[in-house]
Interface confidence: low
């Protein structure tokens, strides 16, 4: 309606004696600014005077006169929008209607606001969600329709009279729409909060109690259970009886069903609050609980661990690890089901008790072949001693032991023999699968671990074999000790160091590189003639006649070996020179005569010189002196001289007679 002034403010405001009231208010006048404002208490319109009667709490006029009441009541508004008021303190008799008489230059308006002042502070109001379930977070709200700037208040939450630990969020509203103070508390109730009293307490600034509101919590929760067991420690022996009782300590709403569980699995036909177990067996050991359900869900009791004690069961042995390599470490573990756990163990190796081994584990830091075998154990607890189980086999693997190379032949072995060797060993695990031989040769292995050397060489000194499984073990080399005839027999000249000259002292050595056996004999031979039986052949003064082809022989018990023929060369000056004449020593003049200087020399004569009867050297230097045609005056005695690197030799005189031809004689 355009003829109305427009006001906005809370319809009713609440307060209590001694507090204050703050009235948020806005308005819009029909025209112009506000010129006069009067605040009435319970105004009544007087038709006679056409004015409002009532207590004037506040008055603002053009002349500015203000009644003394104005100190308590304040108009905090302005001339065109704000009409906010404050009454501080507020009294019980301020309850009723407040009338805001507004006048502008041309218009008047009376706006009514309800004020409700109580004698004592009124209680806040707690608001709860429609349903509360355990462990689900809810928000509790405490609302008070009061707020005033001049009168600070606080709202505190209590649970069973004790301040709640959770932090509350307090908010206030002083608006034209609403005036209130609100506290919100986020809270996760547990089943134990069911039926508990929650209080929202109104306090002044000093924490003094003003009023409160209380509610009883209705926390929906699954049944809460307590389990009782006889005997109380839940430790029994096989054949004993056990009773378990399930007690419901709380359920909201009421429970509907009961069941029992063992190790999480429901027990059939057990739907009462008592579980009776008669003559228990060890299989009945486990975790027991009861389960009771209501509309919220199932609730479970704490678990009772029922221990049915029994003597150890037959034990088994676990080996870490088998097969084991010699030198490695091995751990044996004795496994036996028992309750209580075994306190003592007895260990057996190949049926014999291992002294001093009483632990669940046996550790052998360094396994040796003699550790192999069957390991078993016996476990013992307070109820008795278990039986020895089947045991476990420890297989200790190791390289072949004590490997030897054995010569099968009768001794001695001779060069060229066929030799058979075998590779023997003391023990091996795993079994020997192959053999190796050193040195390698083109030899045959007729069977595993046997080596056959056909036509054994003189130089086959040592042979070693290895027996191999996963590893190879080598035997010490064995000496074949092959016997053979002397080898590499040769003649060696010891002296002189240079060439042999006639008359020199000469020594020849008969050498050989090796012989087995070592004991040898020597033989020297020239042209099939035995010369000596020593390793050396000596000439005190060599003569050209000693030259020739020499051999030496060395023999041992196996055989004899000859050297290559060695030529002994003796160097000497020309000797046995003579002049031979052809066709004879008497030649007819005019014919041809040839004189030859014959000699024995080593090296051969390299240079000849011819002499006549006057010892005159002739200008001829070859072996033959040819006279052609021969003249009578050539008659006479001739001799020659031969020269080689060793020296010279001369012939005796040889006479040539040249006679006249018949013609010459005829001419005479």
């Amino acid at each position: 309606d355009s003829s109305k002034w427009v006001f906005e403010h809370p319809e009713t405001l609440y307060a209590w004696e001694g507090a204050c009231v703050w009235i948020p208010c806005t308005y819009r006048a029909l025209d112009g600014d506000l010129e006069s404002f009067i605040l009435f208490h319970n105004p009544e319109y007087n038709k006679n005077t056409s004015k409002f009667d009532g207590t004037r709490l506040y008055e603002s006029t053009k002349d500015g006169k203000v009644p003394s009441e104005q100190k308590r009541v304040q108009f905090l508004g302005d001339k065109n929008k704000n009409c906010t008021l404050s009454i501080h303190p507020v009294h019980l008799n301020d309850s009723g209607q407040l009338g805001l008489r507004m006048e502008s230059k041309t218009e008047k308006w009376m706006e009514r606001i309800h004020l409700n002042v109580s004698e004592r502070p009124f209680p806040p109001h707690i608001q709860l969600p429609p349903e509360i379930q355990e462990s689900q977070e809810v928000t509790l709200t405490c609302l008070l329709n009061f707020s005033c700037y001049g009168y600070p208040i606080q709202l505190q939450w209590l649970l069973e009279g004790v301040p709640m630990r959770q932090a509350a969020v307090t908010s206030t509203s002083l608006t034209i729409k609403s005036v209130f103070t609100r506290s919100e508390l986020k809270f996760s109730p547990q089943w134990s909060h069911h039926g508990k009293i929650v209080t929202c307490q109104l306090q002044d600034a000093d924490g003094k109690f003003l009023s409160n509101d209380t509610v009883q919590l209705n926390v929906k929760h699954t049944p809460k259970l307590e389990i009782k067991v006889t005997p109380s420690d839940a430790i029994v022996r096989e054949g004993d009886s056990v009773t378990m009782t399930c007690e419901v300590s709380s359920s909201n709403p009421e429970y509907t069903t009961v069941s029992w569980l063992k190790d999480g699995t429901s027990l059939k036909k057990q739907n009462t609050f008592t579980l009776n177990l008669r003559e228990v067996t060890k299989d009945q050991s486990g975790k027991y609980c009861c389960q009771v359900s209501n509309d919220v869900g199932p609730g479970r009791s704490e678990e009772v661990f029922l221990q049915v004690q029994y003597a150890p069961e037959p034990s088994t042995v676990q080996i870490l690890h088998s097969p084991a390599v010699e030198g490695s470490q091995v751990e044996f573990l004795c496994m036996s089901l028992a309750n209580p756990l075994p306190t003592n163990y007895t260990w057996y190796h190949n049926g014999k008790e291992m002294q001093g081994r009483t632990e669940e584990k046996v550790h052998i830091p360094k396994i040796l072949p003699w550790h192999a075998g069957t390991y078993s154990c016996v476990a013992e607890n307070i109820l008795g001693t278990g039986q020895r189980g089947p045991g476990a086999e420890l297989d200790v693997q190791y390289p072949p032991k004590k490997v030897t190379t054995v010569i099968q032949n009768p001794m001695p072995i001779r060069e060229g023999d066929t030799v058979t060797l075998s590779c023997n060993y003391n023990s091996s695990n795993p079994s020997v699968t192959r053999y190796e031989w050193k040195p390698h040769g083109a030899w045959e292995e007729p069977s595993l671990g046997v080596l056959k050397i056909q036509n054994v060489g003189w130089d086959n000194t040592t042979i070693a074999c290895a027996a191999c499984n996963s590893w190879c073990s080598w035997a010490s080399p064995v000496a074949l000790n092959v016997q053979y005839a002397p080898r590499d027999v040769r003649v060696r000249k010891i002296k002189p160091l240079s060439e042999i000259h006639s008359g020199n002292s000469v020594s020849l050595q008969c050498d050989f590189s090796s012989s087995h056996p070592k004991e040898v004999q020597f033989f020297w031979e020239k042209n099939g003639r035995l010369l000596g039986k020593e390793s050396q052949l000596n000439f005190d003064s060599i003569s050209p006649e000693d030259a020739g082809s020499y051999s030496c022989w060395v023999n041992n018990s196996i055989g004899q070996t000859a050297s290559k023929a060695w030529t002994l060369e003796v160097l000497y000056a020309p000797r046995r020179l003579r002049v031979s004449m052809s066709p004879g020593d008497q030649v007819m003049e005019g014919k041809s005569a040839t004189l030859t200087c014959e000699s024995d020399a080593n090296p051969p004569v390299s240079h000849y010189t011819w002499f006549d009867w006057n010892n005159q050297s002739l200008p001829y230097h070859s072996q033959k002196l040819r006279l052609e045609p021969v003249k009578v005056q050539h008659s006479g005695a001739y001799w020659c001289q031969g020269t080689n690197s060793v020296g010279k030799g001369r012939s005796p005189l040889s006479t040539l007679t040249v006679y006249y031809s018949p013609e010459t004689i005829g001419r005479r």
């Epitope: 030198g327 470490q329 002294q355 001093g356 081994r357 550790h363 830091p365 360094k366 040796l368």
Partner: antibody
Framework: KVQLQQSGAGLVKPGASVKLSCKAS????????LHWLMQRSGQGLEWIGW????????KYNEKFKDKATLTADKSSSTVYMELSRLTSEDSAFYFC????????????WGQGTLVTVSA | ENVLTQSPAIMSASLGEKVTMSCRAS?????IFWYQQKSDASPKLWIY???NLAPGVPARFSGSGSGNSYSLTISSMEGEDAATYYC?????????FGSGTKLEIK
């Protein structure tokens, strides 16, 4: 030839630590267990513990668990024993010894190291 | 731990005399090992696995025993046998030694 060469004698103050060494030669280091033993002057032998270089495993005599720490350096074939928080009670000869392959028993011994703890 | 008790602690013997020393274990053991130690020297393995002589040990030495009771015997004492002899067990950890028997020449 199997040899165990131990470090030289040492004079140490109470509360301090000392690290003894035992260098092995003449055999494959990782093949045998090396033990440490203690012998106080004029007294018997006490086993401290063993170190197995093949696997790095160690076993201590409970009595020496907080006293001795065994380690090894495979590259130099050396086993070490560190003795900590020394007191005069720890003054003794310390030997390293080796299990012989093929039988238990300490077949090879180091020459021993004399440790003297004195302020 | 298994305590080994050696007796006597000290003994003396004439050259050529037979010598026997004993070693008792508080708990039964599989085998006993014997060591010889001379002054200012490292111990030497003397007898292994109760009765086996270590390499280089003279044949006049012998070892025997089982369970808790073991002994070392010298058939004919010689001057070089004067030393301290220790027994030791390898059956259970910790490996323990006896306190030794000191053998002197009379």
């Amino acid at each position: 030839k199997v040899q165990l060469q131990q470090s030289g004698a040492g004079l140490v103050k109470p509360g301090a630590s000392v690290k003894l060494s035992c260098k092995a030669s003449g055999y494959t280091f990782t093949d045998s267990i090396l033990h440490w033993l203690m012998q106080r002057s004029g007294q018997g032998l006490e086993w401290i513990g063993w170190f197995y270089p093949g696997s790095g495993s160690i076993k201590y005599n409970e009595k020496f668990k907080d006293k001795a720490t065994l380690t090894a350096d495979k590259s130099s074939s050396t086993v070490y024993m560190e003795l900590s928080r020394l007191t005069s009670e720890d003054s003794a000869f310390y030997f390293c010894a080796r299990h012989e392959d093929g039988y238990d028993g300490f077949a090879y011994w180091g020459q021993g190291t004399l440790v003297t703890v004195s302020a | 731990e298994n305590v080994l008790t050696q007796s006597p602690a000290i003994m003396s013997a004439s050259l050529g005399e037979k010598v026997t020393m004993s070693c008792r274990a508080s708990s039964s053991v599989n085998y006993i090992f014997w060591y010889q130690q001379k002054s200012d020297a490292s111990p030497k393995l003397w007898i292994y696995y109760t009765s086996n002589l270590a390499p280089g040990v003279p044949a006049r030495f012998s070892g025997s025993g089982s369970g808790n009771s073991y002994s070392l015997t010298i058939s004919s004492m010689e001057g070089e046998d004067a030393a301290t002899y220790y027994c030791q067990q390898f059956t259970s950890s910790p490996f323990t030694f006896g306190s030794g028997t000191k053998l002197e020449i009379k």
